[in-house]
Interface confidence: medium
Amino acid sequence: SAPGEDEECGRVRDFVAKLANNTHQHVFDDLRGSVSLSWVGDSTGVILVLTTFHVPLVIMTFGQSKLYRSEDYGKNFKDITDLINNTFIRTEFGMAIGPENSGKVVLTAEVSGGSRGGRIFRSSDFAKNFVQTDLPFHPLTQMMYSPQNSDYLLALSTENGLWVSKNFGGKWEEIHKAVCLAKWGSDNTIFFTTYANGSCKADLGALELWRTSDLGKSFKTIGVKIYSFGLGGRFLFASVMADKDTTRRIHVSTDQGDTWSMAQLPSVGQEQFYSILAANDDMVFMHVDEPGDTGFGTIFTSDDRGIVYSKSLDRHLYTTTGGETDFTNVTSLRGVYITSVLSEDNSIQTMITFDQGGRWTHLRKPENSECDATAKNKNECSLHIHASYSISQKLNVPMAPLSEPNAVGIVIAHGSVGDAISVMVPDVYISDDGGYSWTKMLEGPHYYTILDSGGIIVAIEHSSRPINVIKFSTDEGQCWQTYTFTRDPIYFTGLASEPGARSMNISIWGFTESFLTSQWVSYTIDFKDILERNCEEKDYTIWLAHSTDPEDYEDGCILGYKEQFLRLRKSSVCQNGRDYVVTKQPSICLCSLEDFLCDFGYYRPENDSKCVEQPELKGHDLEFCLYGREEHLTTNGYRKIPGDKCQGGVNPVREVKDLKKKCTSNFLSPEKQNSKSN
């Protein structure tokens, strides 16, 4: 029988009455327009909702917005528009919520054309009160908080000025003109690019990269001939124009731009791009676009210095600069990433890696599924996941894949089972082991969310018709109960739950439509009475992550260590609770050659784990530029994979080669950099 229909599934007793007592409706006294929702702080229960409505008049558009606040996870809302003087808020800037639990909020107002500057409303008490501040400039971007100090804000103006505030937007100072892009780094450092001649667009490839570590008192030029820059983990990347032609190369710094090394990545031409797919303090995934309008490129993974790169995946789907890629970090299990490749026949296939890009493989076919029409062999096929690209192509896919760090092993995604992604209506699949095995969870497209660290999964069918039913599961998607949350169906627009998946509240957003009006409405359902008791020790079971062969004592070893987790038993209906902390037990593994990548000048022949010297580099000076200085590179041919914790076992020490090299690119070398003070 289908999941949810057998006898096993009658576990949650009297749930209708329990949920009915915990379902809270709020009708917003609003014409429909658009709505945006932001959570303020963590575990505070504070939600801000901004509704906006545009009335097109003959010569202009008249806008009206309303601001609502909840402090009980969305059960009740209060209209607080008067706190912002009934001002129209610009939705393209959204609500700028401060980092961590700072309680800070910045709203950017719409101002009339002739005004000297913009206007913001600031709150530092979780939106209980707001202060109106007139700006000495018109903002081009949303206010950006320093990750280290929420009183420090930066913004770009419509005239390309870089403005900084040190007192949470009360007073602003323009610290530099002609700025294209600005980003906060660590320790309240600001990195930004500037143009000298006409504009950001005209000077692309001739920009300068600057740094200030004291909020604009002094500056240092840390790069020239810059096309763009990015920050990822502890790495600072710059895409730099080559001296001789129109190609560009990536340079990397791990000391905030004081010294640079050329990344051992292919150079790209005018129509190509680089993209940092993911980065942490250990390593980076970098996409390098193929020449021509192919829609694909190559993923490379870095060493711990961000300099030496190993080819990870060919024909990686990534449409155009700023376009669509399906690259997804599965946050519920270490080392797991999912993405799509474009096959020779132009079909799209899903690939998964369990070891941080070391090896990629197809997703295993779900046990309870048949291969679809895309499969040549009806008995052999794979699961293919719909992500950003499918959504951009307007396929019937309402949501991207979902995983949460505290819902260990759980991944939920739309997919199809065959030789490639299908354009047919997808179903929803779940993995409870981080992507190793999959099960069909729900028929047809759904919205879904995870509550109580995986203790509850909630889903709503994706339909063009009004809906009034929500589905929920307390056993990781095996069995489903349905609950009618309102007599009058609503046009559904979205599910909202507090980020972090610790909450037991879910808000269903939509609108009602009658002959005369349409209004926003939300239903917030609290599942606390479904999970009546707190989980105890007996409710958890030991689970070894990445286990594929329980026989092997190295079973579960990924990046040099294995982890045993305490996981909630599927049969246990209880609350993990808001304070739930994932319990894991790591064990170090013995090293094998798989724990090492090949250093610069070395490669792995196919089906061999040993690193051998690249024949074309034997006896040659290597085109390798370390910190922009002439120096010898010594290597033993192997380098531990970033983040790998293995000990003992294989220790691939070999004779240390003295690899001479010439610096072909020295425009980021220290002697070319300069400093100045304001």
Epitope: I542, L544, P550, E551, D552, Y553, E554, Q564, Q585, P586, S587, I588, C589, L590, Q647, G648
Partner: antibody, heavy 118, light 107 residues
Framework: EVQLVESGGDLVKPGGSLKLSCAAP????????MSWVRQTPDKRLEWVAI????????YYSDTVKGRFTISRDNAKNTLNLQMSSLKSEDTAMYFC???????????WGTGTTVTVSS | DILMTQFPSSMSVSLGDTVSITCHAS??????IGWLQQKPGKSFKGLIY???NLKDGVPSRFSGSGSGTDFSLTISSLESEDFADYYC?????????FGGGTKLEKR
């Protein structure tokens, strides 16, 4: 009740061989990894070898590698340790121990004595 | 190999005392440590695994703490059947290694 009973300990000359066995009634033997651990006369403990539940994987301490072989017969619920090229420093009480899913020294046998002396 | 250094090698204690035995690992082992008890002339009994987890059937007066390199076993309100030898063992990596043992003797 889970119990492990070792046998086969004896007095043997240096360079000689000996086979120890461990009978494991009272639990599903084939689902557990098993270890041999020895206790020297001065009461120091030394891990000797481990074998996975199905017998596919074995690991040894460097001091016995190449001389000792751990094996199991899941049909008979028996763990074995074949010892050859014995040295005087192999003199010890030998214990078999069960590996549970959490850790490697869950249940212990009563031990059997091996003496290597000329 | 990871060296497990156990202190003290022996101690004289009285009934009702609270006793702490420590083990230092020569390198980080997370909490991959167990504690064993051996009574005179007898075999071994597992007391604690993963540093802090009490094995089923072991009295709650036994507790373990620590992670990384420094660990301890504490017995609160010592009872007569607790006079025995105690060993720590690391199972973070092969070869598994044991501490030198601590003998609890009657004062």
């Amino acid at each position: 009740e889970v119990q492990l009973v070792e046998s086969g300990g004896d007095l043997v000359k240096p360079g000689g061989s000996l086979k120890l066995s461990c009978a494991a009634p009272g639990f599903t033997f084939s689902t557990y990894g098993m270890s041999w651990v020895r206790q020297t006369p001065d009461k120091r403990l030394e891990w000797v070898a481990i074998i996975s539940s199905g017998g596919s994987y074995t690991y040894y301490s460097d001091t016995v590698k190449g001389r000792f072989t751990i094996s199991r017969d899941n049909a008979k619920n028996t763990l074995n340790l074949q010892m050859s090229s014995l040295k005087s420093e192999d003199t010890a009480m030998y214990f078999c121990s069960r590996s549970s899913s959490h850790w490697y020294f869950d249940v212990w046998g009563t031990g059997t004595t091996v003496t290597v002396s000329s | 190999d990871i060296l497990m250094t156990q202190f003290p090698s022996s101690m004289s204690v009285s009934l009702g005392d609270t006793v702490s035995i420590t083990c230092h690992a020569s390198q980080g082992i997370s909490s991959n440590i167990g504690w064993l008890q051996q009574k005179p002339g007898k075999s071994f009994k597992g007391l604690i695994y993963h540093g802090t987890n009490l094995k089923d059937g072991v009295p709650s007066r036994f507790s373990g703490s620590g992670s990384g390199t420094d660990f301890s076993l504490t017995i609160s309100s010592l009872e007569s059947e607790d006079f025995a030898d105690y060993y720590c063992v690391q199972y973070a990596q092969f070869p598994y290694t044991f501490g030198g043992g601590t003998k609890l003797e009657k004062r």
